[in-house]
């Protein structure tokens, strides 16, 4: 048993995005710090075998298998995978420790498996299993949190259905507006289920887990704040628990709330309240009502009523399915080359949305926010100015939502020309779409300025490139214009742009000629 | 390296619920399937098995102390946080969290790395 | 719940000595059986795992044998540093519970 080396089995996350199949590797790429996976020695296995815990990797992430030998001498190795064997180059680091590796580039469910590490030293021979399994995120989920009121208690459990299960967090916030975002230092956050300060101005409670985070925040009416100049509404699916919260500060303890629906005082057992003193020995009121499941007769508008302040209502709407309502007619754009410029979609969603910005088949992260009249609004103002076509893409379990934009940046046209035997060929892709002309130089028109009128064909928008619209225009050559030097231009309302042919030549003469008009 | 450190209060009272939390480095619960326990061992007395969760997110927890034990873990902060409610100074001892690597072969060599243990005393 | 009883609680031996702990366990446990060693303050350490495999980096003079209910920890040569407590561990089925400890003592 002494005899045995001391394996140290590690796991190496890379930040890169290289495209390829498990390869044996010494080299080091853009890595995280390596991860230990418990290497033991296997019992009751015959021959010496190490295992490693069992590895779990996102699909298309690149990782590396690596062991660490301290044992005297030098070693041979092999690896082996699903039966084939794939080079092994052992190497020795700076505190002479043999060190395999095993990069796996871009994971797919063809590189998972086990991976044995067959190693030969001076003294024994044994073998290292790894286990790589893809994780398997199709049985995630993540769902908004609800409220639920704590038993015997004034306390609000807050509640997240999710797999693997969430860690559950308040986020509280005692500012107004703006100060009350994410990472403000305003902003309390609480990692616990149960929450028993319910005054705060601003009260959400959020569930993280591998799939991302999801929040919900307590719906509140303070009878100290003007009113909204829109009713404020709220949206609940049939089942869903209704809470909501109306808060109120006075002078002194002489003052009450009450909850109303349509005009009728809510049942007994369908509300409770909370009373605190405040630092400044105002007393502070807060009334919540709620329905633990809601059903279509629970619609209408809720008012909460003071004896020493105006009352508020707020429009609750019980609908059967969730949605999303904005217009899904494309829109275009044309904008400067330094204008500034987003796009913008204006909704209104329920549940909250998940949406996401492509251009060029690459997505972009999506914000949104929600405005005073109960729309939210999710802009993109990362385009860089690259014309062509952006889309918008909503959804939120229930309903999906796309709406197309294109962007046209306007600016002078650039011609790009080839020749071929039979034929000259020249594109540009300017906005406004230009227009084409060809003209012939020769002695007389040394300037090229004699328009050649026939055996031009032009090809408006033939390519769309993600939405970006190309020009072009060719010009079959006659035999007399063999051996011709011919000009294309291409204009719009920002200028001109030529290029000069020299006929039945593979290729554009070796000058532009760019005139700007 | 890999280590496993404990945090939490060092002095809690009769009655009120105790938060522990196991902080661990040089490995992950994303990548590599690991479990975690809780073990602890009042002054001059044996060890005591406290629960368990899987990298699946199974929990076990012991038999006696079930109704009053809640684990969890939060993979992005690399913790395992142990609650235990309604304490008693019976409940003074250091506690331990101990790492449980998982194998396909579906052997186990139970726990290979613990931490340094945090004490808690039980007093009013 | 598995009950696994330790025996002896406490011995006293020389350095050079050959030392036997034993863990009885109340049902079948297969190999689910583990060994740690613990000294005064610090954090228990494994020695052995299903219930004969010795874990890397500990000196061979430790063992393990056994299957099923008895299981046995021996020390070939006692040491100066292997004075310390010594705990089993079933792991078989829960709750995993551990022997009430052996402490080994200069005599």
């Known amino acids: 048993n002494q005899d045995l080396p001391v394996i140290k089995c590690v796991l190496i996350n890379h930040k890169n995005n290289d495209s390829s199949v498990g390869k044996s590797s010494s080299y080091p790429m853009v890595s995280e710090s390596p991860e230990d996976l418990g290497c033991a020695l296997r019992p009751q296995s015959a021959g010496t075998v190490y295992e490693a815990a069992t590895v779990e990797v996102d699909v298309s992430a690149s990782i590396t298998l690596q062991v660490l030998v301290d044992t005297p001498g030098n070693i041979s190795c092999l690896w082996v995978f699903k039966h084939s064997s794939l080079n092994c180059q052992p190497h020795f680091d700076v505190q002479n420790r043999g060190v395999v590796s095993m990069v796996i580039l871009k994971m797919t469910e063809t590189q998972a498996g086990e991976y044995l590490l067959f190693i030969q030293s001076e003294a024994t021979n044994y073998t290292i299993l790894f286990t790589v399994s893809i994780r398997n995120t199709l049985l995630f989920t993540l769902r908004r949190p609800y409220f639920r009121k704590m038993e015997n208690q004034d306390a609000l459990v807050c509640i997240s259905e999710s797999v693997p299960e969430p860690i559950v967090e308040w986020v509280l916030c005692d500012s107004q507006g703006e100060s009350c975002k994410e990472e403000s230092p305003a902003v309390v956050k609480k990692e616990e289920k149960v929450l028993h300060e319910l005054f705060g101005t601003d009260i959400r409670c959020c569930a993280r887990n591998e799939l991302g985070r999801e929040c919900t925040r307590l719906f509140t009416i303070d009878l100290n704040q003007t009113p909204q100049t829109t009713l404020p509404q709220l949206f609940l699916k049939v089942g869903e628990p209704l809470w909501i919260r109306c808060k109120a500060v006075h002078v002194n303890h002489g003052f009450g709330l009450t909850w109303e629906l349509e005009n009728k005082a809510l049942e007994e057992g369908s509300y409770f309240e909370m009373s605190t003193y405040s630092t400044n020995r105002t007393m502070i009121r807060i009334l919540f009502a709620f329905v633990s499941s809601v059903a279509r007769n629970d619609t209408g508008y809720y008012t909460c009523s003071s004896s020493k302040h105006p009352s508020q209502s707020a429009l609750v709407t019980i609908v059967e399915k969730g949605f999303i309502n904005a217009t899904n007619s494309s829109e275009d754009y044309e904008i400067d080359q330094y204008e500034e410029f987003c796009f913008s979609v204006r909704f209104k969603a329920y549940p909250q949305i998940r949406c996401t910005w492509t251009f060029s088949r690459k997505s972009f992260p999506c914000e949104q926010k929600g405005l005073d009249d109960g729309y939210s609004v999710s802009k993109f103002c990362n385009h860089k100015h690259q014309p062509g076509e952006y889309i918008f893409h909503a959804e939120n379990g229930d309903a999906q939502f796309t709406k197309m934009f294109t962007l046209n940046i306007r600016r002078k046209p650039q011609v790009l020309a080839e020749a071929s035997a039979s034929q000259a060929s020249c594109s540009s892709d300017g906005y406004p779409l230009p227009s084409w002309t060809w003209k012939k130089c020769s002695d007389k028109s040394p300037n090229c300025t004699e328009d050649i009128p026939e055996g031009v064909w032009n090809r408006k928008a033939n390519r769309k490139v993600f939405g970006q619209w190309v020009s072009s225009s060719t010009l079959n050559m006659s035999e007399a214009m063999k051996g011709f030097l011919v000009k294309c231009c291409a204009y719009n309302s920002l200028g001109t742009s030529c290029e000069t042919i020299l006929l039945n030549s593979p290729g554009p003469f070796p000058f532009i000629q760019d005139s700007i008009s | 390296q890999v280590t496993l450190k404990e945090s939490g209060p060092a002095l809690v009272k009769p009655t009120e619920t105790l938060t522990l939390t196991c902080t661990v480095s040089?490995?992950?619960?994303?990548?590599?399937?690991?479990?975690v326990s809780w073990i602890r061992q009042p002054p001059g007395k044996a060890l005591e098995w406290l629960a368990h969760?899987?990298?699946?997110?199974?929990?076990s927890y012991s038999t006696s102390l079930k109704s009053r034990l809640t684990i969890s873990k939060d993979t992005s902060k690399s913790q395992v946080v142990l609650t235990l409610t309604n304490m008693d100074p019976v409940d003074t001892a250091t506690y331990f969290c101990?790492?449980?690597?998982?194998?396909?072969?579906?052997?186990?060599?139970?726990?290979?790395?613990w931490g340094q243990g945090t004490m808690v005393t039980v007093s009013s | 719940d598995i009950q696994m009883t330790q025996s002896p609680s406490s011995l006293s031996a020389s350095v050079g000595d050959r030392v036997t702990i034993t863990c009885r366990a109340s049902?079948?446990?297969?190999?689910?059986l583990g060994w740690y060693q613990q000294k005064p303050g610090k954090a228990p350490k494994r020695l052995i795992y299903a219930a004969s495999t010795l874990q890397s980096g500990v000196p061979s003079r430790f063992s393990g044998s056994g299957s099923g209910t008895e299981f046995t920890l021996i020390i070939s040569s006692l040491q100066p540093e292997d004075f310390a407590t010594y705990y089993c561990?079933?792991?078989?089925?829960?709750?995993?519970?551990f022997g009430q400890g052996t402490k080994v003592e200069i005599k």
């Open positions: 040089g490995f992950s619960f994303r990548n590599a399937r690991m479990g």
């Open positions: 561990l079933q792991h078989n089925s829960f709750p995993w519970t």
């Open positions: 969760i899987f990298s699946n997110d199974e929990k």
């Open positions: 101990a790492r449980m690597p998982e194998y396909s072969s579906g052997w186990s060599g139970a726990f290979d790395i």
């Open positions: 049902q079948d446990i297969g190999y689910d």
